[in-house]
Interface confidence: low
């Protein structure tokens, strides 16, 4: 599995997303758990209701909630107020018995308030030494709108002056194509963007 | 109790489109997934798809890909399948059938609907 | 697409036999599996879940076995009004043949 790159604000919520294949894991529960260290094993944060056909009914466990699409083969991690303790590595998990197979592994960035007005240097806390330079990114940016009917990511204003990235990303990233992920049901603070790699070819 | 009470027979003409509609009652709509079942006269059982009640999202049968359509009603608690451009072997019977959370498989079944195709 | 293969197609037992049937997956389907019974002109009614769970109201002559690739249905003491079709059902996947051809049991 390659690992796929979510980018949050502190403070705000982001939201993972986790694909399958909706009929190989017909009638399995799901989980998230963090990763203790490369080789450690991953641990358990939460998974979804007990009763599989409930799967879409959201679940918490502290800031973090779970639901899963069973139907549409899509598993949501939310993240509420993200914190630079929340960046590292997780898992979207399918259960079966006492197995678990990797939907897709998580790499969580946690990038600074952008009002903060910091220095680019500061934005990212990073999650892991590892580099992950084959990693397929999904920037999931949420921000509350700025007394706008849209949210502010839809502004106007140039994509680089308006995205906090961590350093070492270009502010458009060649290679990369830009596409805006509709989900206002979910994201009342504000939107998404995901930015998907055209050359990854990881399978789920 | 619970009940699936499904729409009554139809004949139809090759190329044509039929949907049949199955009311549930006794039970909480949305709290369960919807599946469509046929059988064709003295065959087998086929599972043709499944709806999820809340979002609407399906899977359907690789067979019926492109031609099946599962939808829903929440507010009067009824799943629809519409099955396009007909052919004579699609005559059949066609059950819904509810999945329940405990088992997975299906435990009730509507009381079947004749649909037959014929020039 | 997995293929669910139930053996005998068909067998003439008596009342009070024992009767046993099997369904074989082309592929592990772990315990995803459940039988029904259907009788002419009637809906399919479910018998056992999860390979070996008894539907409630199922009478206790039923019993399932199985897991992975191969499954049993038994019937202990068969009686008059178990005379039917029995097809298995597998659920761990959802491709377009997910039901065995089933089983038909006849009065010898």
């Known amino acids: 599995h390659n690992t796929t790159v979510f980018q949050g604000v502190a403070g705000q919520s982001l939201q993972v997303s986790c694909p399958y294949d909706s009929m190989k894991h017909w009638g399995r529960r799901k989980a998230w758990c963090r990763q203790l260290g490369e080789k450690g094993p991953c641990q358990r944060v939460v998974s979804t209701h007990n009763l599989w056909l409930l799967s879409f009914l959201r679940r918490w466990n502290g800031s973090t909630a779970i639901t899963d699409d069973t139907l549409g083969g899509t598993l949501t991690i939310t993240l509420r107020n993200l914190q630079p303790h929340d960046a590292g590595l997780y898992q979207c998990q399918s259960l079966h018995g006492s197995e678990a197979d990797t939907l897709r592994k998580v790499l969580v960035e946690v990038l600074a308030d952008p009002l903060d007005h910091r220095d680019a240097g500061d934005l990212w806390f990073p999650g892991e030494s590892e580099s992950f330079e084959d990693a397929h990114v999904e920037h999931s940016i949420s921000r509350p709108s700025q007394g706008s009917h849209l949210p502010s990511c839809l502004s106007k204003e140039p994509l680089g002056r308006r995205n906090p990235l961590p350093t070492h990303f270009h502010p458009s990233p060649p290679g990369l194509h830009l596409s805006h992920q509709d989900s206002s049901s979910q994201r009342p603070l504000g939107c998404s963007l995901a930015w998907t790699e055209a050359r990854d070819t990881s399978t789920q | 109790q619970v009940q699936l009470v499904q729409s009554g027979a139809e004949v139809k003409k090759p190329g044509a489109s039929v949907k049949v509609s199955c009311k549930a009652s006794?039970?909480?709509?949305?709290?369960?997934?919807m599946s469509w079942v046929r059988q064709a006269p003295g065959q087998g059982l086929e599972w043709m798809g499944v709806?999820?009640?809340?979002?609407?999202?399906?899977v359907y049968a690789q067979k019926f890909q492109g031609r099946v359509t599962m939808t829903r009603d929440t507010s009067i608690s009824t799943a629809y399948m519409e099955l396009s451009r007909l052919r004579s072997e699609d005559t059949a019977v066609y059950y819904c059938?509810?999945?329940?959370?405990?088992?997975?498989?299906?435990?009730?079944w509507g009381q079947g609907t004749l649909v037959t195709v014929s020039s | 697409d997995i293929q669910m293969t139930q053996s005998p197609s068909s067998l003439s037992a008596s009342v009070g036999d024992r009767v046993t049937i099997t369904c074989r997956a082309s592929?592990?389907?772990?315990?995803?599996l459940a039988w029904y019974q259907q009788k002419p002109g009637k809906a399919p009614k479910l018998l056992i879940y999860?390979?070996?769970s008894l539907q409630s109201g199922v009478p206790s002559r039923f019993s399932g076995s199985g897991s992975g690739t191969d499954f049993t249905l038994t019937i202990s003491s068969l009686q008059p009004e178990d005379f039917a079709t029995y097809y298995c059902?597998?659920?761990?996947?959802?491709?377009?043949?997910?039901f065995g051809q089933g089983t038909k049991v006849e009065i010898k």
């Open positions: 592929q592990d389907i772990s315990n995803y």
């Open positions: 059938a509810r999945i329940p959370s405990y088992t997975y498989a299906f435990d009730y």
């Open positions: 006794g039970y909480t709509f949305t709290g369960y997934h």
């Open positions: 709806i999820n009640p809340v979002s609407g999202n399906t």
């Open positions: 059902f597998q659920y761990r996947h959802m491709p377009s043949q997910t």
């Open positions: 999860r390979a070996s």
